[in-house]
């Protein structure tokens, strides 16, 4: 039987130091190219091997980035979001939303009236 898939959403503040080749990740999303339907938010699409984000280890592909150095990423064009990161300076603070998939056991297993008690 299939289990129900739920999501656990958590937020985290991640402070990155720009490395010799930058922050080391790619983003998708923005008001002009929604990555998630009805959501113009900015999402991490790729973490570059040996880049600053990969070496830090906390930022994950699929994370939603809510703000950069306290600046909200809501309602931005994709390129405006990219430019915000590129101009964010040496020390960069990211507020991110992790969405973890949680598997809830098979539907109907030990439901009401199940004699296996």
């Amino acid at each position: 039987m299939n289990g129900r898939v739920d999501y656990l959403v958590t937020e985290e503040e991640i402070n990155l130091t720009r490395g010799p080749s930058g922050l080391g990740f790619n983003i998708v999303g923005g008001t002009d190219q929604q990555y998630v339907s009805n959501d113009s938010g900015i999402y991490v699409s790729r973490i570059k091997e040996n880049g600053a984000a990969a070496l830090d280890g906390r930022l994950q592909e699929g994370d939603k980035i809510l703000s950069v150095n306290g600046q909200d990423l809501k309602n931005l064009l994709h390129q405006d979001a990219v430019d915000l990161f590129r101009n964010a300076g040496y020390a960069v603070s990211l507020r991110v939303q992790h969405r973890l998939q949680v598997q809830n056991g098979p539907i109907g297993h030990r439901g009401e009236g199940d004699p296996s008690g």
């Epitope: 080749s21 994709h78 990161f85």
Partner: nanobody, 124 residues
Framework: HVQLVESGGGLVQAGGSLRLSCAGS????????MGWFRRAPGKEREFVAA????????YYADSVKGRFTISRDNAKNTVYLQMNSLKPEDTAVYYC??????????????????WGQGTQVTVS
């Protein structure tokens, strides 16, 4: 991803000009950041010029500013590098690169996912 094919390289005398072309195949070519890099014999690959996807902003290495011009024709899925006042030190294999969504500057090779095979430019 996009497939990239460079052309236009060759042998030219110092002070001469060449125009390199980079033809891309793939959807949404106009959204990609495009860059030119070069590798001279015995040297590291270095950034030459780049043009952003959505706005067409251009960036140049100090060594080519005022001599090289990058441009793009999205209708033809092609990026160009016009090289004027060529010098012997411009001799290298020139590579075209495409990337999307990197939060890092376009001068970084890591900002690009797709690369062409390169075209040789020799300035005598």
């Amino acid at each position: 991803h996009v497939q990239l094919v460079e052309s236009g390289g060759g042998l030219v005398q110092a002070g001469g000009s060449l125009r390199l072309s980079c033809a891309g195949s793939g959807r949404s070519f106009s959204s990609y950041d495009m860059g030119w890099f070069r590798r001279a014999p015995g040297k590291e690959r270095e950034f030459v010029a780049a043009i952003s996807g959505s706005r067409g902003s251009t960036y140049y290495a100090d060594s080519v500013k005022g001599r090289f011009t990058i441009s793009r024709d999205n209708a033809k899925n092609t990026v160009y590098l016009q090289m004027n006042s060529l010098k012997p030190e411009d001799t290298a294999v020139y590579y075209c690169a495409a990337g999307f969504g990197s939060v890092d500057g376009l001068e970084y090779s890591g900002s690009y996912d797709d690369w062409g095979q390169g075209t040789q430019v020799t300035v005598s």
